[in-house]
């Protein structure tokens, strides 16, 4: 059962796992949610009746029954983890805490103009978990405007104390706001020889990399595969760090793989969601339950539905035993990973999917694309929306993309002459325009946010956000697309598609069925040569065939240029402008979304 409200002046008795320090009960709940075992917590707020050394303590708790006895206690705030909830969860915490000093290892001290600048510095520093900033009113003259970057083993403060005229806050890496490079490369036959901060068991290097990504201290990792010569180290995932933030050296070792934390691009990759099955593999751990199940998929469902289950092993039925049902072993451990991984025993293992909601919804795999043809099929581009105007009569105006449950990203030039959001309707999950009837459900638009530097499409800043009046419930036919990561600027996208209901040639009409075309990206230098009369800026991106023939056209504006990278779709461009349609040596010009990620996040994450 999902309980989101906090229980004031209430303490949960017993079940303690560990104690951390958090600046608020709300953040304590987030820490509990991300902890592998925590189901409940008790936070102690500052209060004259409480011992100051207990202020800001966040006690993480577990219980076999998923609840604990409640006791009345002033200044105590208790609650439940969001693990029991189905809604999207984020570790992003933009709050600034006034007059609080969050203690940790102060590894960097510098002057900053503001708390915001200090927070940005922390976000762009590989080691930084949180910061404390002494304001210009701070009593000690030599400490004024000092920005202290801090880290700890757990990512949370070791203590929090009251201190006048300072403010504290957390790194915004988990808000997708870091400019740090995202090093996605995995290095085969490689060991990184630096300090191990932790080690866990993992079935493959990808799971090891995801564990590293959400571990607060891990910057890179080494994984020993199941063929590793030393038996005791097989499937071992070593989580590592170094002072420089990078490995000091690389050592060649067969059957080992190494890679980096993807912390700075974690919003566009699955981090918590280990959805694969591992055949002929047994995960060992504390047994929670043994249940009969028809298949390993059914076993995974059982594990996902059992809030304390972290991973499972399914042993298929022997011949016609037990109505063809096998045994499903639901398991857990102190860190969420198997305590040992064994091979060759015939089991099929995997992880709970309960934690998938901690990942951005946009990373969910969608149904395979239909290759060939130009007409799309239902669910192929679930982020694509059709934006209609109702004035003077209802018609398709532009395309757009779902990027959040209340947000559509589109082009600014679509709103030329649009006086009010009231005349706009957003239809999602649509394949054919003919599906749209009087009674077809739509999303009203609450607000149109046009980039304030926009003048005309050709001069750039052709980007706009629509805030919907109601939230989108994600389904297979309507779900968001990931924004590209700022740390991924060097990624070369080779699988890019433009979609829309626009014209198929210059003099044409809006198409009934959503059209798709695979189009290669063109370098900005090449694009500039094709548009000598225009300035192709780094905030634009071009795509098209030299010979022409495939392109976006009138009516596709505002729609996505979607590129698949590492099995995840990214919104690389917004259809903006071009000379004619699909003309030879005239690529389409798109708004380069990665250059506007900060702007998008600023507008969509505004409190």
């Amino acid at each position: 059962e999902c309980v989101t409200q906090l229980l004031k002046d209430t303490c949960f008795e017993g079940g303690d796992i560990t104690t951390v320090f958090t600046p608020s009960a709300k953040y304590c709940q987030v820490v509990c949610t991300y902890h592998p075992r925590c189901l409940l917590f008790t936070f102690t707020a500052e209060s004259p009746s409480e011992d100051p050394t207990r202020w800001f303590t966040c006690v993480l708790k577990d219980s076999v029954t998923e609840t604990l006895p409640r006791v009345n206690r002033t200044a105590a705030i208790s609650g439940y983890s969001f693990k029991q909830c189905s809604h999207q969860i984020s570790a992003c915490n933009k709050d600034i805490y006034v007059d609080l000093d969050m203690k940790g290892i102060n590894y960097n001290s510098s002057v900053a103009k503001s708390a915001q600048e200090c927070q940005e510095r922390c976000t762009d520093d590989v080691h930084c978990h949180f910061f404390t900033y002494a304001t210009r009113q701070f009593p000690s003259l030599e400490h004024r405007n000092i920005c202290l970057l801090k880290h700890t083993q757990t990512g949370t403060p070791t203590r929090i104390t009251k201190l006048d005229k300072v403010v504290s806050g957390f790194s915004l890496k988990s808000c997708a706001l870091s400019n740090l490079a995202c090093i996605r490369d995995i290095f085969p036959n490689t060991v990184f020889a630096d300090s191990n901060i932790d080690s866990v068991m993992a079935p493959d290097a990808f799971v090891c990399g995801r564990i590293c990504t959400h571990h607060p201290g891990c910057l890179f990792f080494t994984f020993f595969s199941q063929e590793w010569p030393k038996e005791s180290q097989r499937n071992l995932c070593l989580l590592k760090t170094s002072e420089s933030g990078l490995p000091s050296t690389r050592i060649k070792k067969s059957k080992a793989l190494s890679g980096f934390s993807l912390q700075s691009c974690r919003h566009s990759i699955p981090v918590f969601c280990h959805s694969s099955f591992y055949h002929d593999t047994d995960f060992l751990g504390e047994e929670l339950d043994i249940v009969a199940a028809k298949s390993h998929e059914a076993c995974q469902k059982l594990c996902t539905n059992a809030v304390r289950c972290q991973f499972f092993t399914y042993t298929p039925a022997q011949a016609s035993c037990n109505e063809g049902k096998g045994k499903c072993y639901l398991k857990l451990s102190s860190n969420g990973s198997p305590t040992k991984i064994l091979h060759g025993r015939g089991g099929i293992s995997g992880y709970t999917l309960r934690l998938c909601k901690m990942d951005n919804e946009c990373t969910t795999k969608i149904k395979p694309r239909i290759v060939g043809g130009t007409a799309s099929v239902r669910g192929e581009w679930p982020w694509q929306v059709t934006l209609h105007t109702t004035s003077p009569t209802q018609r398709h105006l532009c395309g757009g993309s779902i990027i959040g449950n209340q947000w559509i990203l589109t082009a600014a030039h679509c709103f030329y002459g649009v006086e009010s959001p009231k005349i706009l309707r957003v239809y999602s999950g649509i394949l054919n325009q003919s599906e749209i009837k009087e009674d077809t459900s739509f999303f009203g638009v609450q607000e149109i946010i046009i980039h304030d530097q926009y003048k005309m499409a050709e001069s750039g800043y052709d980007i706009a956000l629509l805030k919907l009046e109601t939230t989108v419930n994600y389904t297979d036919s309507q779900r968001p697309i990931c924004l590209p990561s700022k740390g991924d600027r060097n990624v070369i996208y080779t699988d890019c598609w433009v979609t829309g209901w626009g014209y198929r040639k210059l003099r044409d009409k809006i198409q009934n069925t959503l059209q798709k075309a695979k189009i290669p990206l063109v370098t900005n230098e090449e694009c500039q040569k094709r548009y000598r009369g225009h300035k192709i800026t780094h905030k634009m991106i071009c795509a098209g065939y030299r010979e022409g023939g495939k392109d976006a056209c009138k009516g596709d504006s505002g729609g996505p240029l979607s590129c698949k990278h590492n099995e995840v779709w990214h919104l690389v461009g917004i259809t903006s402008w071009g000379e004619g349609c699909a003309q030879r040596e005239r690529p389409g010009v798109y708004t380069n979304v990665v250059e506007y990620v900060d702007w998008i996040l600023e507008k969509t994450q505004a409190v």
């Epitope: 995202c182 490369d185 085969p188 036959n189 020889a193 990078l246 050296t249 690389r250 060649k252």
Partner: antibody
Framework: EVQLLESGGGLVQPGGSLRLSCAAS????????MAWVRQAPGKGLEWVSS????????LYADSVKGRFTISRDNSKNTLYLQMNSLRAEDTAVYYC???????????WGQGTLVTVSS | DIQMTQSPSSVSASVGDRVTITCRAS??????LAWYQQRPGKAPKLLIY???TLQSGVPSRFSGSGSGTDFTLTINSLQPENFATYYC?????????FGQGTRLEIK
């Protein structure tokens, strides 16, 4: 066919700067780790620097650390070496090479000569 | 850092001969060693990696052996085009190091 073409070499005074480029073709450049290796006249080979496919991690020989910067532009299939505070001992033919999973330099360019002299 | 030492620094041989070049690492490098051939005025070419694995397209008269600290490159039945300089390279860890080279010349 894999091709690596270095350019940007020439004569430069000690303390000066030079930027080498290496244009790659015939393979998926963004999938490969790349490196610069140099060879002083009549001498052996010396590894200078390497860069991973994403460009996010670079490694340098101690002899050039802090003076040279390796970078890449995957959209242009080009590798770069920015050389600052050049010394006479940096005089060499500079080769651009691909670094394979075998931990060997699989393919090499023809090299570009850098001469540091007053 | 690992240092590599090649011997001899030069060797003279005739077409059809069998030649052996040795390479020693300053510390154990398992079998992580590569061999290169460089003809005058040309770029080096990878011949062998992992001490004994022939790079594709390299004639079978080239062979490599050894592990730990001592390695050898053997060329059977020398051909005119094999007269060049040969380098070993440790592939155990960064920084990558090459041997100083062995010049193979016609007797």
């Amino acid at each position: 066919e894999v091709q690596l073409l270095e350019s940007g070499g020439g004569l430069v005074q000690p303390g000066g700067s030079l930027r080498l480029s290496c244009a790659a073709s015939g393979f998926t450049f963004s999938d490969y780790e790349m490196a610069w290796v140099r060879q002083a006249p009549g001498k052996g080979l010396e590894w200078v620097s390497s860069i991973v496919p994403s460009g996010g991690w670079t490694l340098y020989a101690d002899s050039v650390k802090g003076r040279f910067t390796i970078s890449r532009d995957n959209s242009k299939n080009t590798l770069y070496l920015q050389m600052n505070s050049l010394r006479a001992e940096d005089t060499a033919v500079y080769y651009c090479a691909t670094w394979g999973d075998s931990w060997g330099f699989d393919f090499w360019g023809q090299g570009t000569l850098v001469t540091v002299s007053s | 850092d690992i240092q590599m030492t090649q011997s001899p620094s030069s060797v003279s041989a005739s077409v059809g001969d069998r030649v052996t070049i040795t390479c020693r690492a300053s510390q154990g490098i398992s079998s992580w060693l590569a061999w290169y051939q460089q003809r005058p005025g040309k770029a080096p070419k990878l011949l062998i990696y992992d001490a004994s694995t022939l790079q594709s397209g390299v004639p079978s008269r080239f062979s490599g052996s050894g592990s730990g600290t001592d390695f050898t490159l053997t060329i059977n039945s020398l051909q005119p085009e094999n007269f060049a300089t040969y380098y070993c390279q440790q592939a155990d860890s960064f920084p990558i190091a090459f041997g100083q080279g062995t010049r193979l010349e016609i007797k």
